[in-house]
């Protein structure tokens, strides 16, 4: 893809220092779609336009990242810039409407489970970790593993700990994690599948 990322970067680089600061502050409170986490305040405030673009894309992927950026710009009163960003990202992109044949997922690697393909994004973006643990307890996770994940202080560190056990899992164990994700954060799964 790349088009949306470039458009986000272009928009952010056109902000004044004061506007960029305001953008970051608004990003900390803007309503997010279900299934998305917030970029941590500490990291966010020190970022330049390039770092912020990369962070937006890694946290929200290109499509939603661009939409979110446009929403914040609009909220700042920068309607024209928001419109330009959305026009740039919609040009030659966007989801196929109902009834249109969807392209094959050529980016997906055969033989690599969805969970493995999207490891980094899942670590960054899964928020409902406790729910996952309860769904996997006794089926995939031992009591010791369950407690070890729960003991971690943040969602990303919990997910990182959970992923430390997956090399020993077979395909069906990974499917059970994926089922739990579909049930708890369906939008995230759908978004990753599109990416």
């Amino acid at each position: 893809m790349g088009r949306a990322r470039d458009a986000i970067l272009d928009a952010l680089e056109n902000l004044t220092a004061e506007e960029l600061k305001k953008f970051k502050l608004k990003l900390l409170s803007v309503p997010l779609r279900e299934g998305y986490g917030r970029i941590p305040r500490g990291a966010l405030l020190s970022m330049d336009a390039l770092d912020l673009t990369d962070k937006l894309v890694s946290f929200y992927l290109e499509t939603y990242g661009a939409e979110l950026t446009a929403n914040v710009l609009r909220d700042m009163g920068l309607q024209e810039m928001a419109g330009q960003l959305q026009a740039a990202t919609h040009q030659g992109s966007g989801a196929a409407p109902a009834g249109i044949q969807a392209p094959p997922q050529s980016a997906a690697k055969p033989g690599l489970h969805f969970i493995d393909q999207h490891r980094a994004a899942l670590i960054a973006r899964v928020t409902n970790v406790e729910w996952l643990l309860d769904a996997l307890y006794g089926k995939v996770l031992t009591d010791e593993q369950y407690q070890a994940v729960r003991a971690e202080p943040t969602n990303p560190s919990k997910m990182r700990k959970l992923f430390s056990f997956t090399p020993a899992w077979n395909w069906t164990c990974k499917d059970l994690l994926l089922q739990a994700l579909r049930e708890s954060q369906s939008y995230l799964v759908e978004d990753l599948e599109r990416s």
């Epitope: 997922q105 690697k109 055969p110 164990c173 059970l176 089922q179 579909r182 759908e190």
Partner: antibody, heavy 122, light 107 residues
Framework: QVQLVQSGAEVKKPGSSVKVSCKAS????????IHWVRQAPGQGLEWMGY????????MYNEKFQGRVTITADKSTSTAYMELSSLRSEDTAVYYC???????????????WGQGTLVTVSS | EIVLTQSPATLSLSPGERATLSCHAS??????LSWYQQKPGQAPRLLIY???NLHTGIPARFSGSGSGTDFTLTISSLEPEDFAVYYC?????????FGQGTKLEIK
């Protein structure tokens, strides 16, 4: 192109077992799951379970747990479904099916075998 | 397990008419639903996956919509070859389940 070719029709006695085969071609056998779905005469479709030949792990519908075993032979790219303790209500067409993409976040069945009729009768 | 209920059980229409088939899930399945067509003596054929994506080679007169618990398969203008049984299937959780089917017959 992807092809799934199943073994021929079987007539079995109640209490016995049946083993249906499904030979796959046109893709890398170990990269995709193979599922089994059955259909009793004039009835709907019922998912029985799947195998992932890459690591031989299988998942089953609890309704059949203990009676169904799904296996795969990587050397011949063939999946097998064995159903034991057969009863008359197991009379059905048994299909093997392969999803559109096993490595995506769902299982939708784009490729099907021709079906194998298993008749259970005394 | 998730139960899928299709309605109507039988739909009698003429070629050229619009067909609307429904599938209701017993719990939220988001967009994880597909539709199949089956003709007598044949294996099912995938039409729509993930609620609204048209499978390769399927005519554009077929379309799918819905999310959560209610889904619809629409055939905009029926062709003679469309008269068959249609099944929905959920991919949200195990065991994977199918609806009981809707028979689309010629009026």
């Amino acid at each position: 192109q992807v092809q799934l070719v199943q073994s021929g029709a079987e007539v079995k006695k109640p209490g016995s077992s049946v083993k249906v085969s499904c030979k796959a071609s046109g893709y890398t056998f170990t990269d995709q799951t193979i599922h089994w779905v059955r259909q009793a005469p004039g009835q709907g479709l019922e998912w029985m379970g799947y195998i992932y030949p890459g690591d031989a792990s299988a998942m089953y519908n609890e309704k059949f747990q203990g009676r169904v075993t799904i296996t795969a032979d990587k050397s011949t790219s063939t999946a097998y479904m064995e159903l034991s303790s057969l009863r008359s209500e197991d009379t059905a067409v048994y299909y093997c099916a392969r999803p559109l993409y096993s490595y995506a976040s769902y299982y939708w069945f784009a490729y099907w075998g021709q079906g194998t009729l298993v008749t259970v009768s005394s | 397990e998730i139960v899928l209920t299709q309605s109507p059980a039988t739909l009698s229409l003429s070629p050229g008419e619009r067909a609307t088939l429904s599938c209701h899930a017993s719990q939220n399945i988001n967009v994880w639903l597909s539709w199949y067509q089956q003709k007598p003596g044949q294996a099912p054929r995938l039409l729509i996956y993930k609620s609204s994506n048209l499978h390769t080679g399927i005519p554009a007169r077929f379309s799918g919509s819905g999310s959560g618990t209610d889904f619809t398969l629409t055939i905009s203008s029926l062709e003679p070859e469309d008269f068959a049984v249609y099944y929905c299937q959920q991919g949200q959780s195990y065991p994977l389940t199918f609806g009981q089917g809707t028979k689309l017959e010629i009026k």
